[in-house]
Protein backbone atom coordinates (compact mmCIF):
# COMPACT_ATOMS: atom_id res chain seq x y z
CA UNK A 1 0.00 0.00 0.00
CA UNK A 2 1.23 3.54 -0.72
CA UNK A 3 2.37 5.35 2.40
CA UNK A 4 -0.08 8.22 2.05
CA UNK A 5 -3.13 5.99 2.59
CA UNK A 6 -2.61 6.95 6.27
CA UNK A 7 -3.18 10.58 5.33
CA UNK A 8 -6.86 10.44 6.17
CA UNK A 9 -9.23 12.16 8.58
CA UNK A 10 -12.77 11.04 9.33
CA UNK A 11 -15.40 13.40 7.95
CA UNK A 12 -17.07 13.35 11.39
CA UNK A 13 -14.21 15.57 12.64
CA UNK A 14 -15.61 18.35 10.48
CA UNK A 15 -19.27 17.80 11.32
CA UNK A 16 -19.34 18.60 15.03
CA UNK A 17 -21.35 21.85 15.15
CA UNK A 18 -20.01 23.15 18.45
CA UNK A 19 -16.27 22.86 17.83
CA UNK A 20 -16.60 23.84 14.16
CA UNK A 21 -18.40 27.01 15.25
CA UNK A 22 -15.76 27.74 17.90
CA UNK A 23 -12.98 27.29 15.33
CA UNK A 24 -14.61 29.75 12.96
CA UNK A 25 -15.31 32.19 15.83
CA UNK A 26 -11.64 32.08 16.82
CA UNK A 27 -10.63 32.78 13.22
CA UNK A 28 -13.04 35.71 13.09
CA UNK A 29 -11.81 37.22 16.36
CA UNK A 30 -8.22 37.08 15.16
CA UNK A 31 -8.99 38.36 11.68
CA UNK A 32 -10.52 41.49 13.23
CA UNK A 33 -7.05 42.20 14.63
CA UNK A 34 -5.33 41.53 11.27
CA UNK A 35 -4.95 44.62 9.11
CA UNK A 36 -2.59 43.12 6.54
CA UNK A 37 -5.24 41.89 4.11
CA UNK A 38 -2.93 41.71 1.07
CA UNK A 39 -1.03 38.71 2.46
CA UNK A 40 -2.78 35.33 2.36
CA UNK A 41 -1.03 32.37 4.00
CA UNK A 42 -3.40 29.58 3.00
CA UNK A 43 -4.38 29.79 -0.62
CA UNK A 44 -3.33 28.94 -4.10
CA UNK A 45 0.39 29.59 -3.57
CA UNK A 46 0.52 27.03 -0.77
CA UNK A 47 -0.66 24.23 -3.07
CA UNK A 48 1.37 25.16 -6.14
CA UNK A 49 3.16 22.16 -7.60
CA UNK A 50 1.65 19.75 -5.06
CA UNK A 51 -0.47 16.90 -6.41
CA UNK A 52 -3.92 16.32 -4.91
CA UNK A 53 -2.81 13.06 -3.27
CA UNK A 54 -0.02 14.85 -1.38
CA UNK A 55 -2.05 17.82 -0.17
CA UNK A 56 -3.07 16.18 3.10
CA UNK A 57 0.60 15.67 3.98
CA UNK A 58 1.20 19.33 3.15
CA UNK A 59 -1.68 20.37 5.40
CA UNK A 60 -0.36 18.14 8.19
CA UNK A 61 2.85 20.19 8.09
CA UNK A 62 0.91 23.46 8.15
CA UNK A 63 -1.28 22.21 11.03
CA UNK A 64 1.73 21.19 13.13
CA UNK A 65 3.47 24.52 12.50
CA UNK A 66 0.28 26.38 13.42
CA UNK A 67 -0.09 24.46 16.67
CA UNK A 68 3.54 24.65 17.80
CA UNK A 69 4.69 28.03 16.52
CA UNK A 70 1.48 30.06 16.43
CA UNK A 71 -1.23 28.83 18.80
CA UNK A 72 1.04 27.94 21.72
CA UNK A 73 2.79 31.34 21.82
CA UNK A 74 -0.62 33.05 21.59
CA UNK A 75 -2.45 30.61 23.88
CA UNK A 76 -3.54 33.24 26.41
CA UNK A 77 -5.31 35.31 23.75
CA UNK A 78 -8.71 35.01 22.07
CA UNK A 79 -10.35 33.22 24.97
CA UNK A 80 -12.54 31.25 25.45
CA UNK A 81 -12.18 29.98 21.88
CA UNK A 82 -8.46 29.24 22.02
CA UNK A 83 -8.70 26.79 24.94
CA UNK A 84 -11.34 24.77 23.08
CA UNK A 85 -9.91 24.89 19.57
CA UNK A 86 -6.32 23.92 20.43
CA UNK A 87 -7.31 20.45 21.75
CA UNK A 88 -9.49 19.91 18.66
CA UNK A 89 -6.62 20.74 16.29
CA UNK A 90 -4.22 18.68 18.41
CA UNK A 91 -6.56 15.71 18.00
CA UNK A 92 -6.46 16.17 14.20
CA UNK A 93 -2.67 16.41 14.33
CA UNK A 94 -2.48 13.17 16.32
CA UNK A 95 -4.74 11.44 13.80
CA UNK A 96 -2.29 12.47 11.06
CA UNK A 97 0.83 11.42 12.98
CA UNK A 98 1.42 8.44 10.68
CA UNK A 99 0.78 10.46 7.51
CA UNK A 100 3.95 10.46 5.40
CA UNK A 101 4.70 10.42 1.70
CA UNK A 102 7.12 8.14 -0.07
CA UNK A 103 7.92 10.34 -3.05
CA UNK A 104 9.67 13.65 -3.53
CA UNK A 105 8.38 16.29 -1.12
CA UNK A 106 10.59 19.12 -2.36
CA UNK A 107 7.69 21.34 -3.48
CA UNK A 108 5.82 20.68 -0.26
CA UNK A 109 8.78 21.66 1.90
CA UNK A 110 9.42 24.75 -0.22
CA UNK A 111 5.80 25.89 0.06
CA UNK A 112 5.61 25.22 3.79
CA UNK A 113 8.93 26.98 4.31
CA UNK A 114 7.58 30.04 2.45
CA UNK A 115 4.52 30.10 4.72
CA UNK A 116 6.67 29.79 7.84
CA UNK A 117 9.01 32.54 6.67
CA UNK A 118 6.08 34.85 5.96
CA UNK A 119 4.67 34.31 9.46
CA UNK A 120 8.09 34.81 11.08
CA UNK A 121 8.82 37.92 9.02
CA UNK A 122 5.53 39.50 10.09
CA UNK A 123 6.28 38.69 13.76
CA UNK A 124 3.29 38.79 16.10
CA UNK A 125 1.03 40.11 13.34
CA UNK A 126 1.99 37.01 11.33
CA UNK A 127 0.82 34.82 14.18
CA UNK A 128 -2.45 36.76 14.39
CA UNK A 129 -2.89 36.35 10.63
CA UNK A 130 -2.35 32.58 10.91
CA UNK A 131 -4.98 32.38 13.66
CA UNK A 132 -7.30 34.48 11.51
CA UNK A 133 -6.90 31.88 8.77
CA UNK A 134 -7.89 28.90 10.95
CA UNK A 135 -11.12 28.76 8.95
CA UNK A 136 -9.04 28.26 5.79
CA UNK A 137 -6.85 25.71 7.59
CA UNK A 138 -10.01 23.85 8.62
CA UNK A 139 -11.37 23.84 5.04
CA UNK A 140 -8.03 22.81 3.57
CA UNK A 141 -7.68 19.90 5.99
CA UNK A 142 -11.23 18.82 5.20
CA UNK A 143 -10.72 19.04 1.44
CA UNK A 144 -7.30 17.38 1.42
CA UNK A 145 -7.67 14.69 4.08
CA UNK A 146 -11.28 13.46 4.04
Amino acid sequence: LPVNTRCKLEVSNFQQPYIVNRTFMLAKEASLADNNTDVRLIGEKLFRGVSAKDQCYLMKQVLNFTLEDVLLPQSDRFQPYMQEVVPFLTKLSNQLSSCHISGDDQNIQKNVRRLKETVKKLGESGEIKAIGELDLLFMSLRNACV
Partner: antibody, heavy 119, light 107 residues
Framework: QVQLVESGAEVKKPGASVKVSCKAS????????ISWVRQAPGQGLEWMGW????????NYAQKFQGRVTMTTDTSTSTAYMELRSLRSDDTAVYYC????????????WGQGTLVTVSS | DIQMTQSPSTLSASIGDRVTITCRAS??????LAWYQQKPGKAPKLLIY???SLASGAPSRFSGSGFGTDFTLTISSLQPDDFATYYC?????????FGGGTKLEIK
Amino acid sequence: QVQLVESGAEVKKPGASVKVSCKASGYTFTSYGISWVRQAPGQGLEWMGWISAYTGNTNYAQKFQGRVTMTTDTSTSTAYMELRSLRSDDTAVYYCARDRGYYDAFDIWGQGTLVTVSS
Amino acid sequence: DIQMTQSPSTLSASIGDRVTITCRASEGIYHWLAWYQQKPGKAPKLLIYKASSLASGAPSRFSGSGFGTDFTLTISSLQPDDFATYYCQQMGEWKAAFGGGTKLEIK
Protein backbone atom coordinates in the same frame (compact mmCIF):
# COMPACT_ATOMS: atom_id res chain seq x y z
CA GLN B 1 -6.25 53.63 -5.58
CA VAL B 2 -7.20 50.02 -6.23
CA GLN B 3 -9.28 49.74 -9.38
CA LEU B 4 -10.25 47.54 -12.32
CA VAL B 5 -10.95 49.26 -15.65
CA GLU B 6 -12.72 47.32 -18.39
CA SER B 7 -12.73 47.79 -22.14
CA GLY B 8 -15.57 49.52 -23.98
CA ALA B 9 -18.94 48.28 -25.17
CA GLU B 10 -19.09 45.78 -28.05
CA VAL B 11 -21.72 44.84 -30.62
CA LYS B 12 -21.33 41.36 -32.11
CA LYS B 13 -23.18 39.12 -34.53
CA PRO B 14 -24.42 35.65 -33.46
CA GLY B 15 -21.65 33.07 -33.86
CA ALA B 16 -18.87 35.63 -33.40
CA SER B 17 -16.46 35.95 -30.44
CA VAL B 18 -15.82 38.79 -28.03
CA LYS B 19 -12.76 39.52 -25.91
CA VAL B 20 -13.17 41.83 -22.92
CA SER B 21 -10.17 43.24 -21.07
CA CYS B 22 -9.81 44.26 -17.43
CA LYS B 23 -6.79 46.35 -16.39
CA ALA B 24 -5.85 46.29 -12.71
CA SER B 25 -3.99 49.00 -10.83
CA GLY B 26 -3.19 49.96 -7.26
CA TYR B 27 -2.37 46.47 -5.96
CA THR B 28 -0.06 43.52 -6.60
CA PHE B 29 -1.80 41.85 -9.54
CA THR B 30 -0.35 38.38 -8.92
CA SER B 31 -1.51 38.27 -5.29
CA TYR B 32 -5.12 37.90 -6.45
CA GLY B 33 -7.21 36.29 -9.12
CA ILE B 34 -9.94 37.68 -11.32
CA SER B 35 -13.49 36.39 -11.49
CA TRP B 36 -15.82 37.22 -14.35
CA VAL B 37 -19.51 37.79 -13.64
CA ARG B 38 -22.21 38.68 -16.13
CA GLN B 39 -25.64 40.24 -15.84
CA ALA B 40 -28.25 40.01 -18.59
CA PRO B 41 -30.65 42.97 -18.87
CA GLY B 42 -33.00 43.01 -15.88
CA GLN B 43 -31.52 39.78 -14.52
CA GLY B 44 -29.33 38.72 -11.62
CA LEU B 45 -25.60 38.09 -11.34
CA GLU B 46 -24.08 34.97 -12.93
CA TRP B 47 -20.56 33.78 -12.14
CA MET B 48 -18.66 32.65 -15.26
CA GLY B 49 -15.29 31.60 -13.93
CA TRP B 50 -12.03 32.54 -12.28
CA ILE B 51 -8.39 32.87 -13.26
CA SER B 52 -5.35 33.07 -11.00
CA ALA B 53 -3.05 35.95 -11.91
CA TYR B 54 -0.29 34.03 -10.09
CA THR B 55 -0.36 30.70 -11.95
CA GLY B 56 -2.84 31.22 -14.77
CA ASN B 57 -4.95 28.35 -13.38
CA THR B 58 -8.59 28.65 -14.40
CA ASN B 59 -11.90 27.35 -13.14
CA TYR B 60 -14.94 27.85 -15.34
CA ALA B 61 -18.61 27.48 -14.48
CA GLN B 62 -20.02 24.32 -16.06
CA LYS B 63 -22.37 26.37 -18.23
CA PHE B 64 -19.49 28.15 -20.02
CA GLN B 65 -17.04 25.25 -20.24
CA GLY B 66 -15.64 24.96 -23.77
CA ARG B 67 -16.94 28.37 -24.82
CA VAL B 68 -15.00 30.71 -22.56
CA THR B 69 -11.26 31.34 -22.19
CA MET B 70 -9.78 33.49 -19.45
CA THR B 71 -6.19 34.70 -19.62
CA THR B 72 -3.93 37.22 -17.90
CA ASP B 73 -0.94 39.32 -18.96
CA THR B 74 1.09 40.00 -15.83
CA SER B 75 3.37 42.45 -17.65
CA THR B 76 0.41 44.83 -18.10
CA SER B 77 -1.68 43.65 -15.08
CA THR B 78 -4.54 42.86 -17.43
CA ALA B 79 -7.06 40.02 -17.44
CA TYR B 80 -9.01 38.94 -20.52
CA MET B 81 -12.22 37.01 -21.01
CA GLU B 82 -13.05 35.63 -24.45
CA LEU B 83 -16.50 34.19 -25.13
CA ARG B 84 -17.05 32.32 -28.39
CA SER B 85 -20.06 31.22 -30.45
CA LEU B 86 -22.09 34.15 -29.21
CA ARG B 87 -25.88 33.90 -29.04
CA SER B 88 -28.49 36.58 -28.44
CA ASP B 89 -28.87 35.43 -24.82
CA ASP B 90 -25.20 36.31 -24.24
CA THR B 91 -26.24 39.98 -24.38
CA ALA B 92 -25.21 41.22 -20.96
CA VAL B 93 -22.95 43.46 -18.94
CA TYR B 94 -19.73 41.58 -18.21
CA TYR B 95 -17.90 42.46 -14.99
CA CYS B 96 -14.45 41.53 -13.80
CA ALA B 97 -13.90 41.36 -10.04
CA ARG B 98 -10.88 40.83 -7.83
CA ASP B 99 -10.72 37.75 -5.63
CA ARG B 100 -8.25 35.11 -4.54
CA GLY B 101 -10.48 32.24 -5.58
CA TYR B 102 -10.06 30.44 -2.27
CA TYR B 103 -13.13 31.27 -0.15
CA ASP B 104 -12.73 34.93 -1.07
CA ALA B 105 -15.38 37.59 -1.70
CA PHE B 106 -15.22 39.95 -4.68
CA ASP B 107 -14.00 43.16 -3.08
CA ILE B 108 -13.20 45.27 -6.15
CA TRP B 109 -15.27 45.33 -9.36
CA GLY B 110 -14.75 46.75 -12.83
CA GLN B 111 -17.30 49.20 -14.22
CA GLY B 112 -18.71 46.56 -16.57
CA THR B 113 -18.66 46.07 -20.34
CA LEU B 114 -21.91 45.85 -22.27
CA VAL B 115 -21.80 43.16 -24.95
CA THR B 116 -24.75 43.20 -27.34
CA VAL B 117 -25.29 40.19 -29.61
CA SER B 118 -27.62 41.03 -32.46
CA SER B 119 -27.99 40.10 -36.11
CA ASP C 1 -23.49 22.57 -7.28
CA ILE C 2 -24.64 24.64 -4.31
CA GLN C 3 -27.81 26.66 -4.95
CA MET C 4 -28.51 29.93 -3.17
CA THR C 5 -32.14 30.90 -2.49
CA GLN C 6 -32.84 34.49 -1.50
CA SER C 7 -36.04 35.89 -0.07
CA PRO C 8 -38.01 37.97 -0.52
CA SER C 9 -37.45 38.83 -4.17
CA THR C 10 -38.96 42.28 -3.60
CA LEU C 11 -39.26 44.22 -0.36
CA SER C 12 -41.03 47.54 0.27
CA ALA C 13 -39.87 49.57 3.25
CA SER C 14 -39.70 53.10 4.60
CA ILE C 15 -36.82 55.31 5.74
CA GLY C 16 -35.81 54.35 9.28
CA ASP C 17 -37.19 50.81 9.03
CA ARG C 18 -35.22 47.79 10.16
CA VAL C 19 -34.95 45.45 7.18
CA THR C 20 -33.93 41.79 6.99
CA ILE C 21 -33.12 39.77 3.86
CA THR C 22 -32.52 36.03 4.05
CA CYS C 23 -30.43 33.63 2.03
CA ARG C 24 -30.42 29.84 2.21
CA ALA C 25 -27.75 27.52 0.82
CA SER C 26 -28.72 24.10 -0.52
CA GLU C 27 -25.96 22.58 1.62
CA GLY C 28 -23.79 23.75 4.52
CA ILE C 29 -21.24 26.42 3.57
CA TYR C 30 -19.93 27.24 7.09
CA HIS C 31 -19.49 31.05 7.03
CA TRP C 32 -18.49 31.41 3.40
CA LEU C 33 -21.17 33.89 2.39
CA ALA C 34 -20.94 37.44 1.05
CA TRP C 35 -23.56 40.15 0.51
CA TYR C 36 -23.48 42.78 -2.25
CA GLN C 37 -25.46 45.92 -2.99
CA GLN C 38 -26.13 46.94 -6.59
CA LYS C 39 -27.68 50.12 -7.91
CA PRO C 40 -29.06 50.45 -11.46
CA GLY C 41 -26.31 50.82 -14.06
CA LYS C 42 -23.55 50.30 -11.49
CA ALA C 43 -21.28 47.43 -10.50
CA PRO C 44 -22.09 45.49 -7.32
CA LYS C 45 -20.42 46.64 -4.12
CA LEU C 46 -19.25 44.29 -1.36
CA LEU C 47 -21.01 44.87 1.97
CA ILE C 48 -20.39 41.74 4.07
CA TYR C 49 -17.99 38.81 3.74
CA LYS C 50 -17.56 35.66 5.83
CA ALA C 51 -21.26 35.97 6.74
CA SER C 52 -20.77 38.71 9.33
CA SER C 53 -17.61 40.72 8.60
CA LEU C 54 -18.24 44.28 7.45
CA ALA C 55 -16.38 45.18 4.25
CA SER C 56 -14.14 48.21 4.16
CA GLY C 57 -16.20 51.33 3.44
CA ALA C 58 -19.55 49.68 4.10
CA PRO C 59 -21.79 51.60 6.55
CA SER C 60 -22.13 50.09 10.03
CA ARG C 61 -25.94 49.95 9.73
CA PHE C 62 -25.39 46.83 7.60
CA SER C 63 -24.81 43.59 9.46
CA GLY C 64 -24.77 39.94 8.55
CA SER C 65 -25.34 36.76 10.52
CA GLY C 66 -25.72 33.04 10.04
CA PHE C 67 -23.70 29.87 9.73
CA GLY C 68 -24.18 26.66 7.78
CA THR C 69 -27.21 27.04 5.52
CA ASP C 70 -29.20 30.05 6.78
CA PHE C 71 -27.98 33.63 6.58
CA THR C 72 -29.44 37.11 7.02
CA LEU C 73 -28.51 40.63 6.00
CA THR C 74 -29.93 43.32 8.27
CA ILE C 75 -30.11 47.06 7.73
CA SER C 76 -30.69 48.56 11.17
CA SER C 77 -32.22 51.86 10.03
CA LEU C 78 -32.96 52.28 6.34
CA GLN C 79 -31.43 55.33 4.64
CA PRO C 80 -32.40 56.85 1.26
CA ASP C 81 -29.13 55.55 -0.22
CA ASP C 82 -30.04 51.93 0.66
CA PHE C 83 -32.77 51.44 -1.96
CA ALA C 84 -31.05 49.00 -4.31
CA THR C 85 -30.85 45.30 -5.16
CA TYR C 86 -29.02 42.99 -2.75
CA TYR C 87 -27.36 39.69 -3.65
CA CYS C 88 -25.94 36.94 -1.48
CA GLN C 89 -23.05 34.90 -2.82
CA GLN C 90 -21.58 31.62 -1.72
CA MET C 91 -17.80 32.11 -1.50
CA GLY C 92 -16.94 28.55 -2.46
CA GLU C 93 -13.55 27.04 -3.16
CA TRP C 94 -12.77 28.20 -6.70
CA LYS C 95 -16.50 28.41 -7.45
CA ALA C 96 -19.14 31.02 -6.70
CA ALA C 97 -22.93 31.13 -6.84
CA PHE C 98 -25.24 34.09 -6.38
CA GLY C 99 -28.74 34.26 -4.99
CA GLY C 100 -31.50 35.62 -7.22
CA GLY C 101 -31.44 39.05 -5.61
CA THR C 102 -33.76 41.14 -3.44
CA LYS C 103 -34.99 44.46 -4.75
CA LEU C 104 -35.51 46.92 -1.91
CA GLU C 105 -38.09 49.55 -2.85
CA ILE C 106 -39.52 52.64 -1.18
CA LYS C 107 -42.93 51.98 0.37
